[in-house]
């Protein structure tokens, strides 16, 4: 085996950048770092066969299967897929290794299967086998984590019923003034399911797998903080667990906490208390209210009271199924080219929504901010003053919501003209949609003031850019105007633009553009 080449098999994942489809080795896309597929010699096989680790690819993903050969001299190669030979063009990298690549753009079911690469070098022949399959993400789920009390212990377990099995982590922030952003030094992450330290300011549990990351915050009422202007509201679906933490700090241990639902003390077994001394010898108490599986009658005002602090409440609302509440009537906006503007949607939803903004079949990420009044807001400002139809789409496990917006940009018309043997046409996309005039230029009217009204046909049509209108005007040729210069003018409240057309024989026509403000 002395003369066997050193080979390396790698997988390169690409982020599609609206690239054109087709096999190509000059990738029109952004590449991720290569993943080693650890090509190993296949035992008990006739000939020298290397087998790469199985490759699972998402539908529509783009990948490159790549082999790096460290062997002296030239190599030739051939790809075989489903009994068809595919062209193979090896090249050499800076380390003088032979590089053979197979690019699969926008993965489909038909591109899944075994890819065989036959390589012939001056010393030996060998085969490399890649098995490519489509990842079955239909079976994948990522569910928001929820909390359970650990049996016989004052600790919380974080559970996320997801496929594949998620990595669960607690994200803790004990900051009063500092930022609780994930990258902040005040934030501590613990990659474990059970949490014993339950006194922190901000406690979240996050679960992540191939589908992404979902987090749940431990709902907390802090009796040492001024209550919010509006009562905090917590939504839950029937059957979900309820967890509310009440936290209070006092100079000594001489205080107690209690939970009430609609002025009735919670039953034993629906709460538990923990206490500790902080570094400055003050006493911290926390009292959890919990229901392992909520029913409709668990709705109501949950009030945490203390013998040394003003009491505070939260409204818990139990719903049969999730919802998205927002006004779905379409909205039209008309702005100037220099005006700053954002589309925005205010909504109330449970569970939290996933959302996108779409324009001209292109989707944009969607930011959300939860406001104090129980509503959330999503705004989209990245329209770059492109007129057309914009769509906000939101969904959660139980509901879907779509809202349409139209953006019109006020601007002076720009005129384009074309002509044939029988007619002349002018087009404009100014807004408001322009009106048209046609004028004939002659010896009698060198300034083109003689208006043409016969044979003019105006229309409004949809442009390729979804939702954007273009106006056109067509002048049918008559003997009276053949051979003359004519001028079409489009005008709206922002100005006028004209094009002059020579009506002679068919073919390319000289157009003279006039811009009149």
């Amino acid at each position: 085996n002395q003369d066997l080449p050193v080979i390396k098999c790698v997988l390169i994942n690409h982020k599609n950048n609206d690239s054109s489809v087709g096999k190509s080795s000059s990738y029109p896309m952004v590449s991720e770092s290569p993943e080693d597929l650890g090509c190993a010699l296949r035992p008990q096989s006739s000939g020298t066969v290397y087998e790469a680790a199985a490759v699972e690819v998402d539908v529509s993903a783009s990948i490159t299967l790549q082999v790096l050969v460290d062997a002296p001299g030239n190599i030739s190669c051939l790809w075989v897929f489903k009994h068809s030979s595919l062209n193979c063009q090896p090249h050499f990298d800076l380390q003088n290794r032979g590089v053979v690549s197979m690019v699969i753009l926008k993965m489909t079911e038909t591109q899944a299967g075994e890819y065989l690469l036959f390589i012939q070098s001056e010393a030996t022949n060998y085969t490399i086998l890649f098995t490519v399959s489509i990842r079955n993400t239909l079976l994948y789920t990522l569910r928001r984590p929820y909390f359970r009390k650990m049996e016989n212990q004052d600790a919380l377990v974080c559970i996320s019923e997801s496929v594949p099995e998620p990595i669960v982590e607690w994200v803790l922030c004990d900051s009063q003034g500092e930022s609780c952003k994930e990258e902040s030094p005040a934030v501590v992450k613990k990659e474990e399911k059970v949490l014993h330290e339950l006194f922190g300011t901000d406690i979240r549990c996050c679960a992540r797998n191939e589908l992404g990351r979902e987090c749940t915050r431990l709902f907390t009422i802090d009796l040492n903080q001024t209550p919010q202007t509006t009562l905090p509201q917590l939504f839950l679906k029937v059957g979900e667990p309820l967890w509310i933490r009440c936290k209070a700090v006092h100079v000594n241990h001489g205080f107690g906490l209690t939970w009430e639902l609609e002025n009735k003390a919670l039953e034993e077994g629906n709460y538990f208390e923990m206490s500790t001394y902080s570094t400055n010898r003050t006493m911290i108490r926390i009292l959890f209210a919990f229901v392992s599986s909520v029913a409709r009658n668990d709705t109501g005002y949950y009030t945490c009271s203390s013998s040394k602090h003003p009491s505070q409440s939260a409204l818990v609302t139990i719903v049969e199924k999730g919802f998205i509440n927002a006004t779905n009537s379409s909205e039209d906006y008309e702005i100037d080219q220099y005006e700053e503007f954002c589309f925005s949607v205010r909504f109330k939803a449970y569970p939290q929504i996933r959302c996108t903004w779409t324009f001209s079949r292109k989707s944009f990420p969607c930011e959300q901010k939860g406001l104090d009044n129980g509503y959330s807001i999503s705004k989209f400002c990245n329209h770059k003053h492109q007129p057309g139809e914009y769509i906000f789409h939101a969904e959660n496990d139980d509901a879907q919501f779509t809202k349409m917006f139209t953006l019109n940009i006020r601007r002076k018309p720009q005129v384009l003209a074309e002509a044939s043997a029988s007619q002349a046409s002018c087009f404009s996309d100014g807004y408001p949609l322009p009106s048209w005039t046609w004028k004939k230029c002659s010896d009698k009217s060198p300034n083109c003031t003689e208006e043409i009204t016969e044979g003019v046909w105006n229309r409004k049509a949809n442009r390729k850019v979804f939702g954007q209108w273009v106006s056109s005007s067509t002048l049918n040729m008559s003997e009276a105007i053949k051979g003359f210069l004519v001028k079409c003018c489009a005008y709206n409240s922002l100005g006028t633009s004209c094009e002059t057309i020579l009506l002679n024989s068919p073919g390319p026509f000289p157009f003279i553009q006039d811009n009149i403000s």
């Epitope: 609780c180 903080q225 906006y333 700053e340 925005s344 901010k369 939860g370 104090d372």
Partner: antibody, heavy 124, light 110 residues
Amino acid sequence: EVQLLESGGGLVQPGGSLRLSCAASGFTFSSYAMSWVRQAPGKGLEWVSAIGGSGGSTYYADSVKGRFTISRDNSKNTLYLQMNSLRAEDTAMYYCARDYYAFSDPAYGGMDVWGQGTLVTVSS
Amino acid sequence: NFMLTQPHSVSESPGKTVTISCTRSSGSIASNYVQWYQQKPGQAPVLVVYDDSDRPSGIPERFSGSNSGNTATLTISRVEAGDEADYYCQVWDSSSDHWVFGGGTKLTVL
């Protein structure tokens, strides 16, 4: 050029009234929510009142509710603040300000164009 | 209604980085979009950061904002003498439909 110009300030006795005006130019006035913000001598900024682009929505600080009225005339590109039952603590420089975004939800954006202010002094 | 608390004053030498904090008296400021204004003596305020971290055109990149959890922060890097001014944070209180300003921070460039 986008501009706001306040007028109507002056000296008034406690209990008296005053009407401030703010003339806007250089932008589509009706597309923007507008606000009045005041600053007492040597003190910080205090928001007074706001009005939506069409004039349909109005908002007031608790300290002026019931005494001040905000309005606008979009045909004249002018914002107004009618101030009644004036008190000594209303003494301040009054600025009119435009929202950063056209047609904006008030939850975001802030105010990007400010006038130079008009001084209101309430004193006997 | 909640209040916004800012340090009364901060000072820094030219070329250094200075931060000004803005905290809410109750609730999380992360549920608000935060604006920052600069006001020099005898002048009207100028918007320097809006929507937590965006900058209007004409405002130098040295001005940046962030907002999460309990605190919003205005950061001015490579501080210059011309940055000496009062700085105010501002949010919209969606519960009471009010604009709320912080008390202001006087920045002194040493």
